[in-house]
């Protein structure tokens, strides 16, 4: 007695798939595999399959049911902090070849990394035109101010809303200042935060306000304080620079905007007699801390002239270093003062029309605004590699 094994039914490929190998008939132990077109994946029920092969059995049936080739779905794209995502192909369409467009909140953020256009690729990932699978970044626009020019010299002016949106008030032991960098860093003077270097959480950081004592401000807290390794407390002010990392990003608006770091070309806007602007709540001519944020426009002073001014006692030789710049009037009267420490001396970059930090309020004569003496500021352009390293590492 002999029996012939039943041939199996001819396998009909599922939509968007094909059978391999193609044979006239399939008998016992013959097999076929299903391959899906690009952008489709094998699914058995709801479960994805890496591959599919069916074998013809003795009774003339296949050992596995036919799978489906289902279109790849990248799923809802991740939210973009300080940005949005738009569905371009159709509302909510997230399947193979669908296009989405990321964009950043207008005015205050700009897109970094790529153009924000992503396509759902066959691997199930949203992918940019450059092949990146990570999200783009919405970086805060820096150096925006309601003030359009530094212009002529005048002093002791009250700041108006949006004039110095990078201004940060630092409380914690003493009153000091800082300037917002990006949306989670504060640039300040090392001497202003030295005591809190191991207790960052003790720093009370306020921004988005003009009035020093106002209850209306945006609160930020420090996660870490980074003091320049070349700074020696109580031994001069060389390398008087520090960075504070905030424990949360702040929301950027017209009253809270970061200051720009100087470009390589920035020195051309910081030559002798160019005007910089210092702002803060420090001591005024009346000898009290200012209630309202004040600012003063002051010219850059020739470095040799400043060095000479601080060569005489009681100042030790070499007080003014190449890491410092000086600003003020020979006749005095316009200056930053105690309580302004750590604040930014800013300049307008006329090419980009953005304000950048050229100096950090560091030190000066015992009597602020004294004739023949000048305010001394940390020269920020010398520290760009240090700043960039800290920010990228942490």
């Amino acid at each position: 007695y002999t029996s012939t094994a039943q041939p199996c039914p001819y396998p009909m490929a599922p939509p968007n798939g094909h059978v391999s190998p193609v044979q006239a008939k399939y008998i016992l132990k013959d097999s076929f595999s299903i391959f899906c077109e690009t952008g489709y994946e094998l699914l058995q029920g709801h479960l994805p399959l890496k591959s599919f092969t069916a074998v013809c059995q003795k009774d003339g049936s296949w050992d596995r049911p036919m799978p489906a080739c289902s279109i790849v779905d990248c799923g809802p794209p991740d939210d973009l902090p300080s940005g949005r995502v738009e569905y371009i192909t159709g509302p909510g369409v997230t399947t193979y070849k669908a296009v989405i467009q990321y964009s950043c909140e207008e005015t205050f953020y700009t897109m970094k990394v790529n153009d924000g256009k992503y396509v759902c690729e066959a691997d199930g990932f949203w992918t940019s035109s450059k092949g990146e699978k990570s999200l783009p970044v919405c970086e805060p626009v820096c150096g925006l101010s309601a003030r359009t020019t530094g212009g002529r010299i005048y002093g002791g002016q009250k700041a108006k809303p949006g004039d110095f949106p990078w201004q940060v008030l630092i409380l914690g032991g003493t009153t000091a200042a800082g300037a917002l960098l990006y949306d989670n860093w504060v640039l300040t003077a090392a001497h202003a935060v030295y005591e809190q270097k191991h207790d960052a959480s003790a720093l009370d950081i306020r921004m988005g306000t003009l009035k020093r004592l106002s209850p209306h401000y945006t609160q930020a807290w420090s996660e870490a304080v980074f003091i320049h390794e070349g700074y020696t407390h109580d031994a001069g002010f060389d390398n008087d620079i520090a960075l504070i990392k905030l424990n949360n990003k702040v929301v950027i608006n017209s009253n809270i905007t970061p200051i720009c770091l100087p470009r390589k070309e920035a020195e051309s806007f910081m030559r002798t007699d160019d005007i910089g602007t210092a702002s803060g709540w420090g001591l005024t001519q009346r000898g009290f801390l200012a209630r309202n944020l004040m600012y003063v426009d002051i010219p850059i002073v020739d470095h040799q002239k400043c060095t000479a001014a601080y060569e005489k006692p009681p100042y030790p030789r070499g007080s003014v270093t190449a890491n410092m710049l000086c600003a003020g009037l020979e006749s005095g009267g316009k200056d930053s003062c105690r309580g302004d420490s750590g604040g930014a001396l800013v300049f307008l970059d006329s090419e980009t029309e953005r304000w950048f930090v050229g100096g950090i309020v560091s030190w000066g004569s015992m009597n602020c605004g004294e004739a023949g003496q000048y305010g001394v500021y940390t020269k920020v352009i010398n520290y760009i590699p240090w700043i960039e390293n800290i920010i990228s590492d942490f």
């Epitope: 994946e41 994805p48 279109i71 939210d79 738009e86 569905y87 909510g92």
Partner: antibody
Framework: QVQLVESGGGVVQPGRSLRLSCAAS????????MHWVRQAPGKGLEWVAY????????FYVDTVKGRFTISRDNSKNTLYLQMNSLRAEDTAVYYC?????????WGQGTTVTVSS | DIQMTQSPSSLSASVGDRVTITCRAS??????????MHWFQQKPGKAPKLLIY???NLESGVPSRFSGSGSGTDFTLTISSLQPEDFATYYC?????????FGQGTKLEIK
């Protein structure tokens, strides 16, 4: 709380125009795609139009293409539907709805009657 | 356009009953990860309310007696134990492709 409030409905003659508005509150309007959906008296629901969060893309049902325009003003948190060349069959309650992947939040609707 | 066919178009039931409404799409509305099918409840004079999204996900605040299932072309909405407030019209809707389309509705009435 999240709220959508439609306005601008009314009685209008065939061939005339009307502009519907939808005021959004309680959420970041600029982060969401928005739709208009309508319901003729005693009938079912019909999707009319969609606009993406930043107005980069918009889509319409065939019966209103070329006559209706969906737009939005993110600074005013408002969605619009400009309806031109109105027909009797456009008579319906018009709802605005939020959501890119489904209609997750609806307004209470505004009634448009096209009649001579 | 994708046609959505709901059945039944109306049904009478009593409080405590288990009710199932079905919806069939004229083509598959499922991808490898999601089914683009949603269910809504509408009461007279009111706006529709989302009950179930992506075939089986219960919208926040919706009672757990509502459930959804299905994939491809065939979907069901189940109410495990009818409550007086559940008497309304129910719509299925696909968001697989534009134009988004709804079923014709199922009117659930008190027996």
């Amino acid at each position: 709380q999240v709220q959508l409030v439609e306005s601008g409905g009314g009685v209008v003659q065939p061939g005339r125009s009307l502009r519907l508005s939808c005021a959004a509150s309680g959420f970041t309007f600029s982060s969401f795609g928005m739709h208009w959906v309508r319901q003729a008296p005693g009938k079912g629901l019909e999707w009319v139009a969609y606009i993406s969060s930043g107005s980069s893309s918009s889509f319409y049902v065939d019966t209103v293409k070329g006559r209706f325009t969906i737009s939005r003003d993110n600074s005013k948190n408002t969605l619009y539907l400009q309806m031109n060349s109105l027909r009797a069959e456009d008579t319906a309650v018009y709802y605005c709805a939020r959501g890119d992947r489904n209609f997750e939040v609806w307004g209470q609707g505004t009634t448009v009657t096209v009649s001579s | 356009d994708i046609q959505m066919t709901q059945s039944p178009s109306s049904l009478s039931a009593s409080v405590g009953d288990r009710v199932t409404i079905t919806c069939r799409a004229s083509q598959s509305v499922s991808s490898s990860r999601y089914s683009y099918m949603h269910w809504f409840q509408q009461k007279p004079g009111k706006a529709p309310k989302l009950l179930i999204y992506h075939a089986s996900n219960l919208e926040s605040g919706v009672p757990s007696r509502f459930s959804g299932s299905g994939s491809g072309t065939d979907f069901t909405l189940t109410i495990s134990s009818l409550q007086p407030e559940d008497f309304a019209t129910y719509y299925c809707q696909q968001s697989w492709e534009v134009p988004w389309t709804f079923g014709q509705g199922t009117k659930l009435e008190i027996k």
